[in-house]
Each structure stands twice: as structure tokens, then as C-alpha cells.
Interface confidence: medium
């Protein structure tokens, strides 16, 4: 239904607190360099304006679109060109081109310092002084570093943050209460960020259709008792919500997400028996809970998939009559039977099925041609199953840090031209899959591993797109999203790469490394490891292990020494010499 004033409609639907939070996220995601105070001022102006429109929808400018209102605000910021360069050119365009232009200028890797968490005491003081401003800073800092973060979900994480601070700031030992809890929220939020970025990439590169296919598979796995029409409706609505968030329409996105949650809770009987716990929660928690609700129990009497999709004599007729519905039904039926498969795998199987029908339905004897299609799925299923087994075995043997190092070596060999910081970030993220997924029950490992890896590799592709340096990476990133992970897995040592010269300064360390937190120490060591591989791409695992063990021993010795500086300056060059010899 059309509203006279879109901004008044959204303000009324969302309420002031969520409205302000979402506008702050939107501005922070568009203009990532502006300070919190600059954005907070704009948010207040927009909120005041929204209130005038609530009071009188016919007031001046209240009928303007949200893109027009928000874009005008952003374009009125002083020194836009000095701070943002060519992004300022967007302001010469009309809507909807202006918004498209803003979207194209979102930076997935902004040059902002890492988000440092203040000391517990300081945090609690500023939180108690002004909780609203404190949470505003959180939204601003996360949103500007993650310009595609799913906005309603960021409000949920802010709410979690708020609850943790409220609880822990009342404790005597604030630090030990806050640290593990906030680390947990941070970890979940980072995973949420890469997953959502993947969804936006899917939407941007391959359109709504690709995202909808993803949604049908995912929803069918989670709600195997819902019929195809119900899954289709949920997939359509979910696609709309994600399209809006990916497109910067955050108020519409949050509003429609709330509507979808309401619909699901009102229609539990036709969707799933597992929703009640989620539906008892308040809005943000409810929507979050629904997004990761456990799979419903699969119906016991499901017929074999072959009946309708292989043995039926009218397969080609049904396919030609309505390809997308027939393939959608196939994806639905296959996915609801396989909660143990990743969505990526299910989409690859559907693609294989489609290709088989395209070929076979134009031949003289279609049933004979497509009769073996399910058997042809076998290698496609075995490949990720083997990947999970191999990698989880390796993780269990090496632990997270060792597993990250193994991945770092592997990926540096596959794409040695990629910058070392990008390789280290990617390997550390990919390596976390072990902790995240390998401890799960057998039937949950594959979906966890592959869908997580796909999301991380999507970030690798986004970073590489900005400055393409590796043909290997370009090749894997330009294919379809579901083929990326198998493509990266299949890459071998890049034979075209000319090894880097050995530079002693790359492997020279100083005593300041001793006082770094464990995570930073690991990053330093992993940076050295990547550089070693770039110097000797064909070094054996044994050679690299020898060098890294020597390096760890050197750090341990010097960091325990009375005179650390002397130890580093005398033992450092010896270490470099030993490294060169070991790799010769």
C-alpha cells in the first residue's frame, strides 16, 4: 500500500530507537570516513524531520523518497570532495542513479584502524554516562568497517552488547566478565558480516534469481515439512528483505524483516514445529533466532526423489512447461531430504540436473539419457565430503593455529602474487572453520564447512577485485558463486610465479614483538611464513616446519632474555642465515 510520506511510515513502523539506529548505520556505511559526531548530527536532523512528517504527512518534502532525503543529506556534508574524492561526483546525479553511485563507492576494505576495545573500566564509565551515545559509537564503528553488514542484525548485536555491559559493569571483576562475552559477540558478528556480504555479492553479480535459489535450498533444509508454495513465499520475502539491505534501503529492509518474522510466527503450523521458542522473544531476538533456528524433523514418508524427477515419463514436458518452477521443485525436494549437505552443494546438484535435462530433453530418447543423472551426482557429493574429512583430520592433529598455517602455505602456493596481509587474513579466517565446524556432529559438518568457506572466499574475491594480481584467483572468482570453493580447492602451485628475492629485513624482528598480544604475535609469525613461501614456493612441509620451529624457539629465547634487544640483534641474523640454509 502506498503512503503519502515514506519517512513517516517507516518512523511509525520502526519506532524512534530503531529508526535512529538504522539511519546511523546507513550513513556510516555510505560515508565510511566521517566521524561519529558528524553522522550523529545528520541522524538527529533526519529524525526531527521524520517527526514533522508524522505530525503532518503533507508538510514540505515529506513526500520525497528516502533515497532522495538521505542522499540530499549526505551531499550537503561540507568538504565532501576533499574527504571522499570521486564519491562527490555521485551528488551530480539524480535518483536512482545517485544511490547506485553511492553503493558502488562502498569500500570493503576501508583504511581505518582496527576497532580497539577500551579497558573495561573506561568502557563501563562511558557506557554508564551515556548508554545511547555509547551504542551509537558501536553501530558507527562496525557499520563503517562493514558497509554491507545486515542492518537489523547489527541492531541485534548492539542490543547484545548493551545487555553484556549492563550485566558486567555491575560486577566487581568487570574485565573477566566482559572479555569472553564480548569476544563471543565479536566472533559471531564477524561471521555474520562475511555471510551477509556473500548474499549481497550473489544479488549484485547474479541477480535476485540466484539469491532466491539459495533461499529455497536453505529454507527447504530448515523447514522440510513446509510445502513448496510456503517455501516459495518465504524465499520471495527473504529475497526482498536482503535486496533492500544490500541496496542500502535499511529502513524498508528492517521493516520487511519484522513483517516476515511476524508472518512466520503466525503460520508456524504450515512452516515448522521448532519456531515457538523464537516467537516468544522480542523483535530483534525473534528475527535473529528465526534466522538460525534448528532444522525441523524430516517427514518420515518422503518418497524417493527419483519418482518425480527421473522415473516420471513427463519429466521433459514438465521441465519445458515451466523450467524455473520444475527446477525449483527439484531443489526444494532434494534440499528437504538433505539437511546434511551444504547449500552450495545443493545448488551445484540442481545445476547439474538442469544441464542434464537441457541436453537430454532435446534428444531422441530423453528417459534413457537422463536416467543416470542421480548416479552422476555422486562425484559432486564425494568431493566436499572428502574435503571436510581431510581438513577436519588436519585441524584435529594441528589445532587452530597450526591449521591456519597449513592453509596459509597452501593458499600462498596457489596465489603467491596476492598481498601478504590479504593471504594472512584469509588463512586465519579459513582456519577458523576447524574450531567452528569440525567439533559439530558428523551430519552438520559439511554444511558448516562449505558454506563458511564460500563466504570467506567471497571476501578474498572482493579484495582481489580491487587490485587483481593473480590469474588463478581471477579465474576462480569470475565463475559462479557455488563453483568458487571447488575451484580454489582444485588450484595447485602457481607455476608462472617468479619467486621473491630473499630480503633479510622481512625476517628481522625486534623486542617489541614480545609485548604484543598473542593474536598479534601469531600474525607476525604468519606474515613471515607467507613471505618464506613466496621466496620458496616449492619448499616442502618439512622444510617450512623446521624454519618455523626455529623461529618460534628464537622468539621464546629472546623474549625470556634479560637483555632482549641484544638477543634480537645478535640472534636475529643467525636465524636468517639458518633459514636460508634450510630452504636452500
Amino acid at each position: 500500500e502506498a503512503h503519502k510520506s515514506e519517512i513517516a511510515h517507516r518512523y511509525n513502523d520502526l519506532g524512534e530507537q530503531h529508526f535512529k539506529g538504522l539511519v546511523l548505520i546507513a550513513f556510516s556505511q555510505y560515508l565510511q570516513k566521517c566521524s561519529y559526531d558528524e553522522h550523529a548530527k545528520l541522524v538527529q536532523e533526519v529524525t526531527d524531520f521524520a517527526k514533522t512528517c508524522v505530525a503532518d504527512e503533507s508538510a514540505a518534502n515529506c513526500d520525497k523518497s528516502l533515497h532522495t532525503l538521505f542522499g540530499d543529506k549526505l551531499c550537503a556534508i561540507p568538504n565532501l570532495r576533499e574527504n571522499y574524492g570521486e564519491l562527490a561526483d555521485c551528488c551530480t546525479k539524480q535518483e536512482p542513479e545517485r544511490n547506485e553511485c553511492f553503493l558502488q563507492h562502498k569500500d570493503d576494505n576501508p583504511s581505518l584502524p582496527p576497532f580497539e576495545r577500551p579497558e573495561a573500566e573506561a568502557m563501563c564509565t562511558s557506557f554508564k554516562e551515556n548508554p545511547t551515545t555509547f551504542m551509537g559509537h558501536y553501530l558507527h564503528e562496525v557499520a563503517r568497517r562493514h558497509p554491507y553488514f545486515y542492518a537489523p542484525e547489527l541492531l541485534y548485536y548492539a542490543e547484545q552488547y548493551n545487555e553484556i555491559l549492563t550485566q558486567c559493569c555491575a560486577e566487581a571483576d568487570k574485565e573477566s566478565c566482559l572479555t569472553p562475552k564480548l569476544d563471543g559477540v565479536k566472533e559471531k558478528a564477524l561471521v555474520s558480516s562475511v555471510r551477509q556480504r556473500m548474499k549481497c555479492s550473489s544479488m549484485q553479480k547474479f541477480g535476485e534469481r540466484a539469491f532466491k535459489a539459495w533461499a529455497v535450498a536453505r529454507l527447504s533444509q530448515t523447514f522440510p515439512n513446509a510445502d513448496f508454495a510456503e517455501i516459495t513465499k518465504l524465499a520471495t520475502d527473504l529475497t526482498k528483505v536482503n535486496k533492500e539491505c544490500c541496496h542500502g534501503d535499511l529502513l524498508e529492509c528492517a521493516d520487511d524483516r519484522a513483517e516476515l518474522a511476524k508472518y512466520m510466527c503466525e503460520n508456524q503450523a504450515t512452516i515448522s514445529s521448532k519456531l515457538q521458542t523464537c516467537c516468544d522473544k522480542p523483535l530483534l531476538k525473534k528475527a535473529h533466532c528465526l534466522s538460525e533456528v534448528e532444522h525441523d524433523t524430516m517427514p518420515a514418508d518422503l518418497p524417493a526423489i527419483a519418482a518425480d524427477f527421473v522415473e516420471d515419463q513427463e519429466v521433459c514436458k514438465n521441465y519445458a512447461e515451466a523450467k524455473d518452477v520444475f527446477l525449483g521443485t527439484f531443489l526444494y525436494e532434494y534440499s528437504r531430504r538433505h539437511p546434511d549437505y551444504s547449500v552450495s552443494l545443493l545448488l551445484r546438484l540442481a545445476k547439474k540436473y538442469e544441464a542434464t535435462l537441457e541436453k537430454c530433453c532435446a534428444e531422441a530418447n530423453p528417459p534413457a539419457c537422463y536416467g543416470t543423472v542421480l548416479a552422476e551426482f555422486q562425484p559432486l557429493v564425494e568431493e566436499p565430503k572428502n574435503l571436510v574429512k581431510t581438513n577436519c583430520d588436519l585441524y584435529e592433529k594441528l589445532g587452530e593455529y597450526g591449521f591456519q598455517n597449513a592453509i596459509l602455505v597452501r593458499y600462498t602456493q596457489k596465489a603467491p602474487q596476492v598481498s601478504t596481509p590479504t593471504l594472512v587474513e584469509a588463512a586465519r579466517n579459513l582456519g577458523r572453520v576447524g574450531t567452528k565446524c569440525c567439533t559439530l556432529p558428523e551430519d552438520q559438518r559439511l554444511p558448516c564447512v562449505e558454506d563458511y568457506l564460500s563466504a570467506i572466499l567471497n571476501r578474498v574475491c572482493l579484495l582481489h577485485e580491487k587490485t587483481p594480481v593473480s590469474e588463478h584467483v581471477t579465474k576462480c572468482c569470475s565463475g559462479s558463486l557455488v563453483e568458487r570453493r571447488p575451484c580454489f580447492s582444485a588450484l595447485t602451485v602457481d607455476e608462472t610465479y617468479v619467486p621473491k628475492e630473499f630480503k633479510a629485513e622481512t625476517f628481522t624482528f625486534h623486542s617489541d614483538i614480545c609485548t604484543l598480544p598473542e593474536k598479534e604475535k601469531q600474525i607476525k609469525k604468519q606474515t613471515a611464513l607467507a613471505e618464506l613461501v613466496k621466496h620458496k614456493p616449492k619448499a616442502t612441509a618439512e622444510q617450512l616446519k623446521t624454519v618455523m620451529d626455529d623461529f618460534a624457539q628464537f622468539l621464546d629465547t629472546c623474549c625470556k632474555a634479560a637483555d632482549k634487544d641484544t638477543c634480537f640483534s645478535t640472534e636475529g641474523p643467525n636465524l636468517v642465515t639458518r633459514c636460508k640454509d634450510a630452504l636452500a
Partner: antibody
Framework: EVQLVQSGTEVKKPGESLKISCKIS????????IAWVRQMPGKGLEWMGM????????RYSPSFQGQVTFSVDKSISTAYLQWHSLKTSDTAVYYC??????????WGQGTLVTVSS | ELVLTQSPGTLSLSPGERATLSCRAS??????VAWYQQKPGQAPRLLIY???NRATGIPARFSGSGSGTDFTLTISSLEPEDFAVYYC???????????FGQGTRVDIK
């Protein structure tokens, strides 16, 4: 190149029968549905129904059920639209079109049928 | 029975202007919507299928959007050859039946 070529203009009297054709070339005739669409003078497009060439299974829009018949001849890759007893209200241009993944492309050039006493 | 309503009935614009054509369905129809262009004396030509995908050979100035019940065809900058009648077409979910909107005429102002 995929082509649908329709038979020429027809002028008929009420009560007469008529069969118009749509010859397909450039793709496997048995792999796609063929639809028929009516356009009365100065009016919009109306979907009449469609036929599946391999076994001549026909689907009719409720408005056209019993009024027309679809058929095919696989040996010459041709689809037909037939009337047993024409009415003046059947005056229109009739198009055949290939159903391709949920939409129609390409279309025949159209056959004008005029029914007048 | 599903009804498709196109608006406006006629759109009078000059070359270079942006044309926005609307198609509203009486019930949610997923994204099974196509847009066709028809010039006088010619057969319709497919422009957009599945709401937002351009058909082969269709210029980038034509774009489709929407889902559920509301769909839009946009011609970003009208060329002289774009003045014609535009039809939206819907497909029901299952079993498939097709419906056309009544058409929008785009005239030269």
C-alpha cells in the same frame, strides 16, 4: 536461427472451418511448448493455450476451451490452430510463439483471420 | 483468477525522457513476469523475463524490477524506436497459465 513462420491471411464466412499453421525451424521441435495468442483489432494480447509437440498434450485457457483445437505434425515441425465453426468475433490476428523458460520468444509474424458474412 | 493491471494506459513522453511503466497483480506471483514490446503491424518482442532479466539483444536502457505483486519496466532514456505498446505477462505458479496486462501505450509528446 530460431524461426516461427505462420500461414497467410484468411478471409472466411461465419460457420466455416479453418486451420492455420506455424512452421518451426532452427531448434528441436519436440523440446519446447508452442503457445497461441489472439489479438483482436485494436485490442491487447490474450493467451489461448499451448501444446506439447512430443505427445500433442494441449492446455487451453478457460475462455478458449471447446472453441478451438491445437494440433501438431512432428514430421514437418508444424503446429496448427483449428476452428470447426467460425464466428465474426473470431476476427483477429493469431500468433504462435515458443515458450522458453516461462516467457514467449520468438513469435511468429501473425496470421490475420477475418470472419465476415 | 489472476488479473494484471497496467498503468498508466498511455504515457506521453519526449525522446530522452525516462519512462516508468507499472504492472500490478491481483495476488502474489513470485517473479514470473515478462515484458513485451509491440509496434503497429508487428508481432510482440520479448524484452524482460522473470521480472528483471533482459532478453538477448535487448539494449541496457530497458530494465525490469519488482516482486510479489508490483512490477516495473523502466526505459532510462527513450529512443525514437521505443514508442510502442508494452505488455506485461504473468505466469501462475503451477500448473502454468498465462495472462497479459491490457498494455501501456508510450506516445511521442
Amino acid at each position: 536461427e530460431v524461426q516461427l513462420v505462420q500461414s497467410g491471411t484468411e478471409v472466411k464466412k461465419p460457420g466455416e472451418s479453418l486451420k492455420i499453421s506455424c512452421k518451426i525451424s532452427g531448434y528441436s521441435f519436440t523440446a519446447y511448448w508452442i503457445a497461441w495468442v489472439r489479438q483482436m483489432p485494436g485490442k491487447g494480447l490474450e493467451w489461448m493455450g499451448m501444446i506439447w509437440p512430443p505427445d500433442a498434450d494441449a492446455r487451453y485457457s478457460p475462455s478458449f476451451q471447446g472453441q478451438v483445437t491445437f494440433s501438431v505434425d512432428k514430421s514437418i515441425s508444424t503446429a496448427y490452430l483449428q476452428w470447426h465453426s467460425l464466428k465474426t468475433s473470431d476476427t483477429a490476428v493469431y500468433y504462435c510463439a515458443r515458450l522458453y523458460s516461462g516467457s514467449y520468444s520468438p513469435w511468429g509474424q501473425g496470421t490475420l483471420v477475418t470472419v465476415s458474412s | 483468477e489472476l488479473v494484471l493491471t497496467q498503468s498508466p494506459g498511455t504515457l506521453s513522453l519526449s525522446p530522452g525522457e525516462r519512462a516508468t511503466l507499472s504492472c500490478r497483480a491481483s495476488q502474489s506471483i513470485f517473479n514470473y513476469v515478462a515484458w513485451y514490446q509491440q509496434k503497429p503491424g508487428q508481432a510482440p518482442r520479448l524484452l524482460i523475463y522473470d521480472a528483471s532479466n533482459r532478453a538477448t539483444g535487448i539494449p541496457a536502457r530497458f530494465s525490469g524490477s519488482g516482486s510479489g505483486t508490483d512490477f516495473t519496466l523502466t526505459i532510462s532514456s527513450l529512443e525514437p524506436e521505443d514508442f510502442a505498446v508494452y505488455y506485461c505477462q504473468q505466469r501462475s505458479k503451477w500448473p502454468p497459465t498465462w495472462t497479459f496486462g491490457q498494455g501501456t501505450r508510450v506516445d511521442i509528446k
